[in-house]
């Protein structure tokens, strides 16, 4: 089996509590993309799901802005503009990590966090229970 | 802005690339998220933009295994089952956040990484250009 | 390769404990989550509780809780399942796996544990 | 927990016959659904991961579908070396496996 040598260019942590507590590194890689969907996409406007989307905000995260999806109706819009109740407009959902400041308002102090956000609706056949 | 007090009850960073390295506690939040609704939820076969989802894998990254969506059809599934090439299935994205070790086997170390994944499909009227 | 390499077999007393190790070779634990199934003789398989190395992170089944303790020990890539007070009923093969969250891809070969007074 | 009934409990077959296993959730579980196979004195081997998808090195002749409580395993053409024990797995909540199909020699 492979023993990792203690690798002398790791940073170390003085922690009582390591590995529980560790060191991350937030020069993003990739960091340079556009966060806001409004402008990287207009699908939720021209979807037949169509979908508002809410700046969630909040100071103690990381990131600090997170868009949540709302779907516009229970139903999709069909081909003559109006809204076919048969069908269900239903959110697509995502878990994703986050970083939380513990103890708040500490800069430099995080929690991980997995929290569930909604990216965008889509028009579904509805479950239809017989009844017996 | 918020400008946020420096907290005396705060860990203190030495890094002198504070505050781009920060502490971590990992006793993740909501780790037990397995009321999930990503999880039980069929949408990719109900949606009238179904798609497949493919594994990607990277056992250097955390999470290891993330599902991407790839839309089954270009068009969508009519009311009478057929694809519909008069609208367009199309990926929703969304970036996400996940760890990598960095330096590579260093326990206590890690590099925060923005990926953009594919969440799911809805169908959305296409874009026109008409020719003048 | 990933292989899964567990410790031997072994015989306890009801009421005593025991602490099976899973020793990756072949590679790191990575990114992974160990989890722990075990198979009574002649049953199906039953998930007891996992760990993800890199974090430390542990998820138990209800049933094992406060029964079974998991760890790892990422300088020797070696997981461990502890389980307590002991009853003849844990009598089983004890298998590690590693485990994406979705799935477990890789299985470490087994351990026989036997309860018997 | 989500209760995974298989069926049938056990199988009587041949080399070359198609055989076909089926698993339902207790609840739906999307398509979180995995198969796999066990021989005597060896620990399981997954086949199926996503309910359809194949695992590298597993041959095509095993196959699987289905979504939310119904799932299926499909061995096209059986072959000497598939007579085993097939479990279903869900991992939509914490897993739970199916009680097992024994496929026996006809």
């Known amino acids: 089996g492979i023993t990792i040598p203690r690798n002398p260019g790791c940073p170390n942590s003085e922690d009582k509590n390591f590995p529980r507590t560790v060191m991350v590194n937030l020069n993003i890689h990739n960091r340079n993309t556009n966060t806001n969907p409004k402008r990287s996409s207009d699908y939720y406007n021209r979807s037949t799901s169509p979908w508002n989307l809410h700046r969630n905000e909040d100071p103690e995260r990381y990131p600090s802005v997170i868009w949540e999806a709302q779907c516009r109706h229970l139903g999709c819009i069909n081909a003559d503009g109006n809204v076919d109740y048969h069908m269900n407009s239903v959110p697509i959902q995502q878990e994703i990590l986050v970083l939380r400041r513990e103890p708040p308002h500490c800069p430099n102090s995080f929690r991980l966090e997995k929290i569930l956000v909604s990216v965008g609706c889509t028009c579904v056949t509805p479950i239809v229970h017989h009844v017996q | 802005g918020i400008t946020i007090p420096r907290n005396p009850g705060c860990p203190n960073s030495e890094d002198k690339n504070f505050p781009r390295t920060v502490m971590v506690n990992l006793n993740i939040h909501n780790r037990n998220t397995n009321t999930n609704p990503k999880r039980s939820s069929d949408y990719y076969n109900r949606s009238t933009s179904p798609w497949n989802l493919h594994r990607n894998e990277d056992p250097e990254r955390y999470p290891s295994v993330i599902w991407e969506a790839q839309c089954r059809h270009l068009g969508c599934i009519n009311a009478d089952g057929n694809v519909d090439y008069h609208m367009n299935s199309v990926p929703i994205q969304q970036e996400i956040l996940v760890l990598r070790r960095e330096p590579p086997h260093c326990p206590n170390s890690f590099r925060l990484e923005k990926i953009l994944v594919s969440v799911g499909c809805t169908c959305v009227t296409p874009i026109v250009h008409h020719v003048q | 390769q990933v292989q899964l390499v567990q410790s031997g077999a072994e015989v306890k007393k009801p009421g005593s404990s025991v602490k099976v190790s899973c020793k990756a070779s072949?590679?790191?634990?990575?990114?992974?989550?160990i989890s722990w199934v075990r198979q009574a003789p002649g049953q199906g398989l039953e998930w007891m509780g996992s760990?993800?190395?890199?974090?430390?992170?542990?998820n138990y089944a209800q049933k094992f809780q406060g029964r079974v303790t998991i760890t790892a020990d990422e300088s020797t890539s070696t997981a461990y399942m502890e389980l307590s007070s002991l009853r003849s009923e844990d009598t089983a093969v004890y298998y590690c796996?590693?485990?994406?969250?979705?799935?477990?891809?890789?299985w470490g070969q087994g351990t026989l544990v036997t309860v018997s007074s | 927990d989500i209760q995974m009934t298989q069926s049938p409990s056990s199988l009587s077959a041949s080399v070359g016959d198609r055989v076909t296993i089926t698993c339902r959730a207790s609840?739906?579980?999307?398509?979180?659904l995995n198969w796999y196979q066990q021989k005597p004195g060896k620990a399981p081997k997954l086949l199926i991961y996503?309910?359809?998808s194949l695992q590298s090195g597993v041959p095509s002749r095993f196959s699987g579908s289905g979504s939310g409580t119904d799932f299926t395993l499909t061995i096209s053409s059986l072959q000497p070396e598939d007579f085993a024990v097939y479990y279903c797995?869900?991992?939509?909540?914490?897993?739970?496996f199916g009680q097992g199909t024994k496929v026996e020699i006809k």
């Open positions: 609840q739906g579980i999307s398509n979180w």
């Open positions: 996503a309910a359809s």
């Open positions: 072949g590679g790191t634990f990575s990114s992974y989550a």
């Open positions: 796996a590693r485990d994406s969250e979705y799935y477990f891809d890789h």
């Open positions: 797995q869900q991992y939509s909540d914490d897993p739970t």
């Open positions: 760990i993800i190395p890199w974090f430390g992170w542990t």
